[in-house]
Amino acid sequence: AGHLEQPQISSTKTLSKTARLECVVSGITISATSVYWYRERPGEVIQFLVSISYDGTVRKESGIPSGKFEVDRIPETSTSTLTIHNVEKQDIATYYCALWEAQQELGKKIKVFGPGTKLIITDKQLDADVSPKPTIFLPSIAETKLQKAGTYLCLLEKFFPDVIKIHWQEKKSNTILGSQEGNTMKTNDTYMKFSWLTVPEKSLDKEHRCIVRHENNKNGVDQEIIFPPIKTDVITMDPKDNCSKDANDTLLLQLTNTSA
Amino acid sequence: AIELVPEHQTVPVSIGVPATLRCSMKGEAIGNYYINWYRKTQGNTMTFIYREKDIYGPGFKDNFQGDIDIAKNLAVLKILAPSERDEGSYYCACDTLGMGGEYTDKLIFGKGTRVTVEPRSQPHTKPSVFVMKNGTNVACLVKEFYPKDIRINLVSSKKITEFDPAIVISPSGKYNAVKLGKYEDSNSVTCSVQHDNKTVHSTDFEVKTDSTDHVKPKETENTKQPSKSCHKPKAIVHTEKVNMMSLTV
């Protein structure tokens, strides 16, 4: 089955610049299929823009200005690229790549979409580092004692743009765990978001990862925030036990960012 | 020109209670096209649900049922037993792939229908309230409550900033919420919640110790704070973006 990945969840540009949006095709040979590009402007219907067929033929939707969009494909990397020239306010949209999934019977084909790339146009001069800055929260003793479960919370702050994806995994597993999250909130010129994961007591001794995808992550790779295992023997300790210099001291894992 | 028009912009559904989405075609006969349904969830992921000729996306066949009403020129998508995972925007789209003609392989979309999922009506449940802390940051975790109306107070005399709470459906079909804030006196911050004509405190859930009154304003009686845990990390907490870490004991 064909699968589409759009590695950029967002692409931030200033007016009149060129945006290049990538779509990586897997599970099917890119040279043997057509790749389609759609856009969804805020409040408008999703609209077909342009496609490139298996033989390299490019088709544009009528009414799309010529020279605005360019589409190509690179078989070596199994990638299709949509280039948007001279970006302007009306180009603000989410751009999806798509393909008809190769099934034997023509009438049984389905069109699958990539996860989309949001084109953001800004006139702001942003700080050097507008990647998400993490703070971790470990489960409270009260929760682990009373509910035999623990909640990890991953707070991400001071990022721009607002497009961000967060998911959770156990350290040595690729399974995405069921988590919950708040809305992305504006704080001055940047954004913040938090996500939380509640795990049963038996999973508290495992390491968990909060995985964050953002346009401005360092080196363009997903950021992994590691949540250390919680020792269950600590959870069930007598509350009067001293496990640090002072029973009222807090053990804090303070994640602090500095920028060069 | 062909146009696909959803019946509603927003459809609230209750967990487990069947719901029907409708999408009518203007300007053409629906029978001349194949109808598709997609769902866009948080994070913009567009997932294929259904295409005419009884084609369903992975995991959708058991809980969704697509149909065409030729007489009324509309497409129908039934969600048989909605769950919180079914929240999102639903799009109908049409194509003529396999019917011949030019440029038939593009999809023409209608506007989305936003499906919001609510827990089904149930006995009222009092929340559990827990506080989590890191530096000046404080999070109030409010678990498993019903109904949704709630007021979360992070109680402090030295507030730096507070954020609106996130209220979401819990896996068990009730509600969970988190409220975050930053406080100079984070060690003494407690959380109190007003819900269903009662006030519930994070201190109600603390492990009881001998306690004396605090001398700071608006604080709780218990000197033990809920997230003053002695959790010992087995591994260094590391992250791509973090280049300085302090362990405060």
């Epitope: - | 709630i150 109190s192 007003q194 004509n197 006030t199 109600d204 304003p217 608006k218």
Partner: antibody, heavy 121, light 108 residues
């Protein structure tokens, strides 16, 4: 009928101590959070302290922190305010008030008639 | 700390007249505002909560409005028993109930 009756107000010297009581009737005291609010002569109302129904949470205004202690005895249907290190500025009528929650809205629906505390040498 | 101000300090009106009392918060309190009435020698009496909801037993001639920082208490036609001091109170930073300084409605 809901009734709250404060007592214990009197004349006390600066630096002295006093214990106010509030006897309640007409409702299940152990189910309600309670507050003390005061009013200096000719002045407006000032919230003083809060206690939750089971006494797990107690909150105080900045002006009384460290000097006043709120407590309750649910078995005796009584609310108390222990006032130490009294100052002239503590001179006021002290009201106890029941806190009700209307769905999620805290309101002070029921008040006592007040007891007068005068701090003077 | 949120500071509440009320205006005017005193309102001199005759029975049957309309009274409009104003309350302003130093920062937004959303709709977390209540109004109380107090007569000499008596305890305060709750009139309005959530800016516009009448408490039990409060007559329809008394109404509240506003949100954010500006609020109004209106008595459409003053009755003799309405002459009293009126306090507004914010509850957004519960449990700290902050009261305004009060508006005295007196007989002209």
């Amino acid at each position: 009928e809901v009734q709250l009756v404060e007592s214990g107000g009197t004349l006390v010297q600066p630096g002295g101590s006093l214990r106010l009581s509030c006897a309640v009737s007409g409702f299940t005291f152990s189910s309600y959070d309670m507050n003390w609010v005061r009013q200096a002569p000719g002045k407006g109302l000032e919230w003083v302290s809060y206690i939750s129904s089971s006494s797990t949470a107690k909150y105080y205004a900045d002006s009384v922190k460290g000097r006043f202690t709120i407590s309750r005895d649910n078995a005796k249907n009584s609310l108390y305010l222990q006032m130490n290190s009294l100052w002239d500025e503590d001179t006021a009528v002290y009201y106890c008030a029941r806190e009700d929650i209307v769905v999620v809205t805290p309101i002070l629906q029921h008040w006592g008639q007040g007891t007068t505390v005068t701090v003077s040498s | 700390e949120i500071v509440m101000t009320q205006s005017p300090a005193t309102l001199s009106l005759s029975p049957g007249e309309r009274a409009i009392l104003s309350c302003r918060a130093s920062q937004s309190v959303s709709k977390d505002l209540a109004w109380y009435q107090q007569k000499p020698g008596q305890a305060p009496r709750l009139l309005i909560y959530d800016a516009s909801n009448r408490a039990t037993g409060i007559p329809a001639r008394i109404s509240g409005s506003g949100s954010g920082t500006d609020f109004t208490l209106t008595i459409s036609s003053l009755e003799p028993e309405d002459f009293a001091v009126y306090y507004c109170q914010q509850r957004i930073n519960w449990p700290l109930f902050t009261f305004g300084p009060g508006t005295k409605v007196e007989i002209k």
